[in-house]
Interface confidence: low
């Protein structure tokens, strides 16, 4: 891994990549863009899927957190031979299938889609792409679009969640590398630390949750701190304040010494969660300490 900024957030990340005929001579640039971006999402709880579309949508790599599978998925991605039409909606369908299945299996993980295309979508194909992106949103996904070369920014703004979710690359495929940092910054919601990380059993505390992207929520009033206690019960608490890099939250009162609370954050009132490796533990505190 090449150092630099990274994302420690635990969520489901779908890459939907244009492999139509028009990218034939630029597949290497697309591959290297995905490879470098993929390596920056480093949470063990982050799952990733690679989807390509042309005249059909194909899931090259199903959702996985297994780094070896991701490495193999990247190898498969490198071997892709572009050709065919730009049926972007096919790619969104492949993502929605997985999101729907995962949700119905009981997982409540946030989903982020990064879709990359070049060129303008013809009227019908734009209609289908927007419709399928809406279906992905119906299933809870946040949608970002990367447009390269001859793309139509107005179209992509309607396929993505908003104009702010579009990353235009006007200088051709070689300029893809230049947007990795901004994509990472915008799409990453991560929990880095909790202060304090040890609290007194039976006492009420406030916890500062350090991280990034907490104000990326569509509505900051729907941000919640979530504490998964001893891998069973989950308690959600409304934060006192929400800033981009920290949350101030009431911690649940944990009555026994040695209890562990894994920290999660929901951006949508507890519908889905960003997971983390941050744990708060309880300890015995004598009077006056």
């Amino acid at each position: 891994e090449d150092g630099g900024p990274a994302c420690y957030g635990g969520f489901d990340l779908y890459f939907i990549l244009d492999k139509s005929g028009s990218v034939l001579h630029h597949w290497n640039e697309i591959y290297y863009f995905v490879e470098q971006l993929a390596h920056k999402f480093i949470s063990p709880q982050l799952r990733m899927s690679f989807i390509v579309f042309s005249t059909r949508g194909t899931t090259l790599m199903k959702l996985t957190e297994d780094r070896e599978q991701i490495r193999q998925g990247l190898e498969e991605l490198q071997k892709v031979l572009p050709g065919g039409d730009t049926y972007m909606h096919e790619g969104f369908e492949r993502a929605s299938e997985q999101i729907y299945y995962e949700n119905r299996q009981g997982y409540r993980t946030a989903s982020v889609i990064i879709a990359l295309t070049d060129g303008e979508l013809h009227e019908d194909l734009f209609f289908y792409s927007e419709r399928e992106a809406n279906r992905s949103r119906d299933l809870g996904a946040i949608v970002y679009c990367v447009g390269v070369k001859d793309f139509n920014e107005t179209q992509l703004a309607r396929i993505a969640d908003s104009k702010d979710h579009v990353f235009p690359v006007n200088d051709g495929f070689q300029a893809l590398q230049g947007i990795i940092h901004s994509i990472l910054k915008k799409s990453c919601i991560e929990i880095l630390a909790a202060e304090p990380s040890t609290i007194c059993a039976g006492e009420s505390f406030q916890v500062v949750v350090r991280g990034n992207g907490f104000r990326h929520a569509r509505n900051v009033d729907r941000v919640l701190c979530s504490f998964k206690i001893n891998d069973s019960v989950t308690l959600n608490e409304k934060p006192f304040s929400v800033e981009d890099t920290y949350l101030l939250c009431p911690a649940p009162i944990l009555k026994e010494v040695g209890m562990k609370a894994a920290l999660q954050v929901s951006m949508n009132d507890g519908l889905s969660f960003i997971s983390s490796s941050v744990i708060i533990t309880t300890t015995h505190c004598s009077d006056g300490s």
Partner: antibody, heavy 121, light 113 residues
Framework: QVQLVQSGPEVKKPGAPVKISCKTS????????ITWVRQAPGQGLEWLGW????????SFAQKVQGRLTMTTDISTNTASMELRGLRSDDTALYYC??????????????WGQGTLVTVSS | DVVMTQSPDSLAVSLGERATINCKSS????????????LAWYQQKPGQPPKLLIY???TRESGVPDRFSGSGSGTDFTLTISSLQAEDVAVYYC?????????FGGGTKLEIK
């Protein structure tokens, strides 16, 4: 515009099978699922089953499970259903409808005109 | 199976008046992950196939007059026709698509008083 045109009325004896076709036009056939719904005389709507035109996945109502077969033919943009072992309570108007999703059975946004099936000895 | 119960069975309303049809599901059809209600409303006029009016409980299908509106969440839903027109005489059905088997309500027959 979107059209679903069903085959003509059928009169069948108990125990016989019936096959109904539903020819579609005006949209990309395998971009939507197809569902089958029936309506007994003077009664409400009863969902029978759904098929994904894209990958052939199916889902059935328990009442017709094992008796109902649904198929699609992408070359002719046609969906068909066959109901075997007909009984008198299968007498109904059978509708095909387009499902707004090709991999999950959602709501039905266009309907065929209906095919009347009469089961009588 | 999710049982859909409509009320009333039939309804007579004067032209220009408001008509309200209720639909109750035996379990919630609100999918918590996306906060959407998996419920649709259909209109069936005599001798015609049903026609989609409302999906996601409150989204009007394109071309449907804005006098038709859907509301409700979880298990209780309402179809409202704000100002009844002669062409609205029909049977109205609710349908859940939250889980298979997909199920319809028994229908509400709307007539002019």
């Amino acid at each position: 515009q979107v059209q679903l045109v069903q085959s003509g009325p059928e009169v069948k004896k108990p125990g016989a099978p019936v096959k109904i076709s539903c020819k579609t036009s005006g949209y990309i056939f395998d971009d939507y699922g197809i569902t089958w719904v029936r309506q007994a005389p003077g009664q409400g709507l009863e969902w029978l089953g759904w098929i994904s035109t894209y990958n052939g996945k199916t889902s059935f109502a328990q009442k017709v499970q094992g008796r109902l077969t649904m198929t699609t033919d992408i070359s002719t943009n046609t969906a068909s259903m066959e109901l075997r072992g007909l009984r008198s309570d299968d007498t109904a108007l059978y509708y095909c409808a387009r499902v707004f999703s090709r991999y999950i059975p959602f709501y039905f946004d266009s309907w065929g005109q209906g095919t009347l099936v009469t089961v009588s000895s | 199976d999710v049982v859909m119960t409509q009320s009333p069975d039939s309804l007579a309303v004067s032209l220009g008046e408001r008509a309200t049809i209720n639909c109750k599901s035996s379990q919630s059809v609100l999918y918590s992950y996306n906060n959407k209600n998996y419920l649709a409303w259909y209109q069936q006029k005599p001798g015609q196939p049903p026609k989609l009016l409302i999906y996601w409980a409150s989204t009007r299908e394109s071309g449907v007059p804005d006098r038709f509106s859907g509301s409700g969440s979880g298990t209780d839903f309402t179809l409202t026709i704000s100002s009844l027109q002669a062409e609205d005489v029909a049977v109205y059905y609710c349908q859940q698509y939250y889980s298979t088997p997909l199920t319809f309500g028994g229908g509400t027959k709307l007539e002019i008083k």
